[in-house]
């Protein structure tokens, strides 16, 4: 057998062979040593003995998409059966007090794998046998501790394939220099060793993208806004954009990268080489948010132009560089840059808000007959914006981090929007105070710090903002 | 015994760049990821990047504005992070720390103070 | 990216006494969580890894516990060397492996 006819169904067309050369992958023309690595097709009776104790789970997640000549990284993450965990050693042993539908388990291994190669025979002197190997023949890579890698991964995509030695989790990078843009499949299959051979136990794929555009993310917030994921903001706010460009293997790294702003109010283009940039909105109303990101990105060569006809008999004019007819200067460097394009799009709508709030006085509410702890205490406050429909008090410590009160209630404030504010302290003391005050889709705050007086007097109330 | 001997600690002004060492013995360099991790002055942990020694491959966490570069001298055994444009808030303590994906040996830690 | 919820962020406790942590994931990460501790001043030690195995030289007083989204450390008859700070931190799926915010054992 050979590796495709042994990793899916998928076949790749001889371009897509041709033109997807991944580094250090190998062919999946290649044959498939059956005797050492069995293998089943889906349905097989014999996957459900292929781990003890139930089937074991391979998640696979890759950080795509990918922008064409990156680093694309998959890992897979084997989920063994409930109750059993991988040890220090590759071994996987049961959980201690842990009971799955067999009960307890008397012996503490489901695999002891150090047992077997400690026990395995057959080896010259370089700890190689003739089942430390891949599908494909290869050996195993000879690192200390290798022998507690107990699993064989076998990566399959665009007609290639992958082998790696592993524990519980491995980790695989690819470049994409030499991929075909748009989904591509990537099957991985694992087996677990078997005394002196393996058995498969789980297969798993996933889609991955690679892609000529940036992938591009945008989050926006503002000060003062009740929800920051609705797309809705206020006017008269700056609003925060920040780019967030996905290149997990930094392949822009040393890139220029700009970002050109249209934000649909009529402000025209802003073009900025900063990630985050501000912008407000002073109209109401729904406005189209466009974003294009250009990076300067490593990309492949042009093609030389074609040398020129060579005249029939040397020219003295030429000289000794004629047999150069790019001349030297122009030998094309093959570190090249392409512009790559990122683009974003939202459409976000702007409304009247609660823009500011003061407290512009604190009065201590003087009480017929005052309780024996209990202070009231008036706060005259004033805002700016939309009319507020509720206010809500947070009294804490003096570091404002530990609450002890917290009291929301609606309010009716007319359109000049000063309102009084009455709120109880037990006890004497220094307090942290956060007044906010909030509609349907702003919430505004201020916070100040209040001295409560012992119940003198003499005594006055002291705000320090 | 597995070791991973930090270089020591630095003092820079906010906009230059600085690049720490972090010197491995006792096991195979090529055959492990080393990682670099941060903790700001009273706080958590944050896994900046890692670098395959083997062939020099690294992957890093977009979510933290850190301008960092990841290199491998695998002649002497030693991961290097260089930290570009520097602001206050890249003070904290770096260190650098072996295996993927979690963390079995870890360096001394260099401590970094960004001030004009 | 997964987010890591640690819970106390600080805990005081006494020699001999039995304290629990937790760490909650925004997303199934299975099993794949470790736990490490970090003494004034000193580096982190990787203490659980695989939410469950003890690392090599860990005492058995530490237990790891849990799978999917919530997880805990038990540290059982509390010795002076285990005050410090403690992180989980998950390992699954592609990078970043993020940490959880921590928790500080004070004596009390």
């Known amino acids: 057998k050979r590796f495709h006819d042994v990793l899916g169904n998928e076949r790749p067309s001889a371009y897509m062979r041709e033109h997807n050369q991944l580094n250090g992958w190998s062919s999946d023309e290649n044959d498939w040593n059956e005797k050492l690595y069995p293998v089943w097709k889906r349905g097989d009776m014999r996957w459900k003995n292929s781990w003890k104790g139930g089937r074991v789970q391979a998640v696979l997640t890759s950080d795509s998409p990918a922008l064409v000549g990156s680093n694309i990284t998959f890992v897979v993450n084997l989920v063994f059966p409930r109750c059993q965990k991988e040890d220090a050693n590759g071994n996987i042993v049961y959980e201690k007090n842990c009971r799955n539908e067999a009960g307890l388990s008397a012996d503490p291994y489901v695999y002891n794998w150090t047992a077997w190669s400690e026990d395995s025979d057959g080896e010259n002197g370089t700890g190689q046998s003739h089942h430390n190997v891949f599908p494909d023949g290869k050996p195993f890579p000879h690192h200390p501790g290798w022998r507690r890698w107990n699993f064989v991964y076998v990566f399959h995509t665009l007609g290639q394939y992958f082998q790696k030695l592993g524990r519980c989790s491995v980790r695989v990078s690819v470049n994409t220099a030499n991929v075909t843009l748009g989904p591509q499949l990537m099957e991985v299959t694992v087996y677990r060793r078997h005394g002196r051979a393996y058995v498969p136990i789980a297969q798993v794929k996933d889609v991955y993208v690679v892609t000529d555009q940036i992938p591009v993310f945008v989050t926006m917030s503002q000060k003062n806004d009740r929800n920051s994921s609705d797309e809705t903001f206020l006017k008269d706010l700056p609003i925060t954009f920040d780019v967030l460009i996905h290149d997990p293997s930094h392949f822009l790294n040393y890139s220029t990268i700009n970002y050109k702003w249209s934000f649909g109010d009529n402000t025209g283009l802003f073009v900025s080489i900063n990630h985050t940039v501000n912008h407000t909105y002073v109209l109401n109303g729904t406005f189209s948010l466009n974003l294009t990101v250009k990076a300067a990105a490593p990309g492949p060569c042009p093609p030389p132009p074609p040398p020129p006809p060579r005249p029939p008999k040397p020219t003295p004019s030429l000289g000794p560089a004629g047999d150069n007819p790019l001349g030297l200067s122009e030998i094309p460097d093959e570190n090249c840059q392409i512009n790559r394009y990122g683009h974003f799009q939202a459409t976000i709508t702007i409304v009247e808000g609660i823009l500011e709030v003061n407290i512009i006085q604190t009065t201590d509410v003087l009480m017929l007959v005052p309780g024996p702890d209990s202070s009231l205490i008036d706060f005259v406050v004033t805002c700016q914006g939309s009319i507020p429909t509720e206010v809500c008090t947070i009294i804490s410590d003096p570091t404002c981090e530990i609450t002890q009160n917290a009291v929301c209630s609606p309010v009716d404030v007319d359109e000049m929007c000063l309102l009084t504010v009455r709120r109880a302290f037990n006890g004497s003391g220094t307090y942290c105070v956060n007044l906010t005050l909030g509609d349907d889709t702003s919430l505004a705050l201020t916070s100040t710090l209040i001295s409560v007086p012992d119940r003198d007097p003499a005594s006055s109330l002291r705000m320090a903002n | 015994e597995v070791q991973l001997q930090q270089s020591g600690p630095e003092l820079v002004k906010p906009g230059a760049s600085v690049k720490i060492s972090c010197k491995a013995s006792g096991y195979t360099f090529t055959d492990y990821y080393m990682n670099w991790v941060r903790q700001s002055h009273g706080k958590s942990l944050e896994w900046i990047g890692d670098?395959?020694?083997?062939?020099?491959?690294?992957t890093y966490n977009q979510k933290i504005k850190v301008k960092a570069t990841l290199t491998v001298d695998k002649s002497s055994s030693t991961a290097y992070m260089e930290l570009r444009s520097l602001t206050s808030e890249d003070s904290a303590v770096y260190y650098c720390?072996?295996?993927?994906?979690?963390?079995?040996?870890w360096g001394q830690g260099t401590t970094l103070t960004v001030s004009s | 990216d997964i987010q890591m919820t640690q819970s106390p962020a600080s805990l005081s406790a006494s020699v001999g006494e039995t304290v629990t942590i937790t760490c909650r994931a925004s997303e199934n990460i299975y099993s794949f969580l470790v736990w490490y501790q970090q003494k004034q001043g000193k580096s982190p030690q990787l203490l659980v890894y695989n939410a469950k195995t003890l690392a090599e030289g860990v005492p058995s007083r530490f237990s790891g516990s849990g799978s999917g989204t919530q997880f805990s450390l038990k540290i059982s008859s509390l010795q002076p060397e285990d005050f410090g700070s403690y992180y989980c931190q998950h390992h699954f799926g592609t990078p970043p492996y993020t940490f959880g915010g921590g928790t500080k054992l004070e004596i009390k």
């Open positions: 720390a072996r295996n993927w994906p979690y963390f079995d040996y």
């Open positions: 670098i395959n020694p083997y062939h020099g491959g690294s």
